[in-house]
Interface confidence: low
Amino acid sequence: EEELQVIQPEKSVSVAAGDSATLNCTVSSLIPVGPIQWFRGAGPGRELIYNLKEGHFPRVTPVSDPTKRNNMDFSIRISNITPADAGTYYCVKFRKGSPDVELKSGAGTELSVRAKPSAPVVSGPAVRATAEHTVSFTCESHGFSPRDITLKWFKNGNELSDFQTNVDPAGKSVSYSIRSTARVVLTRRDVHSQVICEVAHVTLQGDPLRGTANLSEAIRVPPFLEVTQQSMRADNQVNVTCQVTKFYPQRLQLTWLENGNVSRTEMASALPENKDGTYNWTSWLLVNVSAHRDDVKLTCQVEHDGQPAVNKSFSVKVSAHPKEQGSNTAAENTGTNERNIYGGSG
């Protein structure tokens, strides 16, 4: 009697996630009587995939009609393949018995799953940093197979070189993850800048996936302050202006101090954006010179994005105002300020 052969013609099969996989198996003889079963893996821990005789296997269908007595093809089709389905599948012939007795196994077919990487997720630093500082961005993508993958970083279209990438796990796995950390030096012009993490993989047919992060989430551009005195008005009032320029984000509180005492506090809101993404804000104060005997020290105090306050002071010379029309005067960079009679911002 010819020895029973269980033939699995393909050593390996590669399938894209979501597709169906066909695993071929034929037997050389229908004798002795007994079922064919499919397992993933070998040994005591193997997993039953399909049993012709019994059980419910919703994702597995026989390629040929197994109920036909002369059928020697026991190939199966597994639908909706996921990376978790990867492994070596064995077609095994049993002799009918109680229990059924294993007679012969095929050589096995290794199923590898080509799984696309997930959309790269780029995360930036937890706290904002200012220009000239280096911040780290992390890019993560998961669930891909095979392991080979290429990751690149770009800032505004220019490729970055300062990054470190790891693919896990190091050994064999059904799917893999990649994590890369890039170091980016910020500049004041980076409010509108973007970093891009680009992932290329065999499953993507040359169309890489991209993840982006806006540097606006990572950068703080501290404001420039300038306090100036406008022309003296005929009603003996001096208009002092505090110009807060080129700052980001918009979260900013401005306090006027008059001889060290808080006069008014304002919060920036709904400001128009500069072309570079930063903001400007102007606040003004009317000082009634005739109401003061001594010079008045005004301070424009700005708290930006929770940072320590920045001050710019300006002394209104009471003695120097015999109602003549003055010219604009810039302030010195020290720090106190005065109480307004009238005030506003724009």
Partner: antibody, heavy 118, light 107 residues
Framework: EVQLVESGGGLVQPGGSLRLSCAAS????????MHWVRQATGKGLEWVSA???????YYTGSVKGRFTISRENAKNSLYLQMNSLRAADTAVYYC????????????WGQGTMVTVSS | DIQMTQSPSSLSASVGDRVTITCRAS??????LAWFQQKPGKAPKSLIY???SLHSGVPSKFSGSGSGTDFTLTISSLQPEDFATYYC?????????FGQGTKLEIK
Amino acid sequence: EVQLVESGGGLVQPGGSLRLSCAASGFTLSSYDMHWVRQATGKGLEWVSAIGTAGDTYYTGSVKGRFTISRENAKNSLYLQMNSLRAADTAVYYCVRGGVWDDAFDIWGQGTMVTVSS
Amino acid sequence: DIQMTQSPSSLSASVGDRVTITCRASQDINNYLAWFQQKPGKAPKSLIYTASSLHSGVPSKFSGSGSGTDFTLTISSLQPEDFATYYCQQYVSYPYTFGQGTKLEIK
């Protein structure tokens, strides 16, 4: 389910103290700006205090120096420590979550009653 | 502080009516305006943010409009469950402030 549950209200004498708690579930409290809003019986709503995601705090003028807002991330909870209480502080106090991008209030707690009376 | 003024303070209407409540800010608040509904003994419910955006789960019969200083809340066809007090609120700058409320009563 996203939920805010306040506790800690009660009757207190003028000048006394009370600590309100707000337990958040279904979201990470530290990722949102959080607020306290109060409402005296038969009156309108009044914003009391806020804490930002960076820990920055804000108060309405009448409670400044007396009330302190804080949060404990590990317990996913918000607090309002109320000292030097006055009769005018008598109200239902609501814990409110600020929206993600613009701080618009989206989730309100059921409220806890604070009565300041001798 | 920014003052918020609602009008009317109270309003009587019938089921099926279309009603409009207005809210005026003492200074420009862009569109950082929210509307809330409150029923007796209950916490307020958020209806609208950024003047015209509906919170999740809020029926489309509620609509908001306006920008700058003048805003409106419209309820297109009143149902019994809509009779409540409505508040507007600015959240452009601290301290956040509410309108005094508009009580919508059944006629």
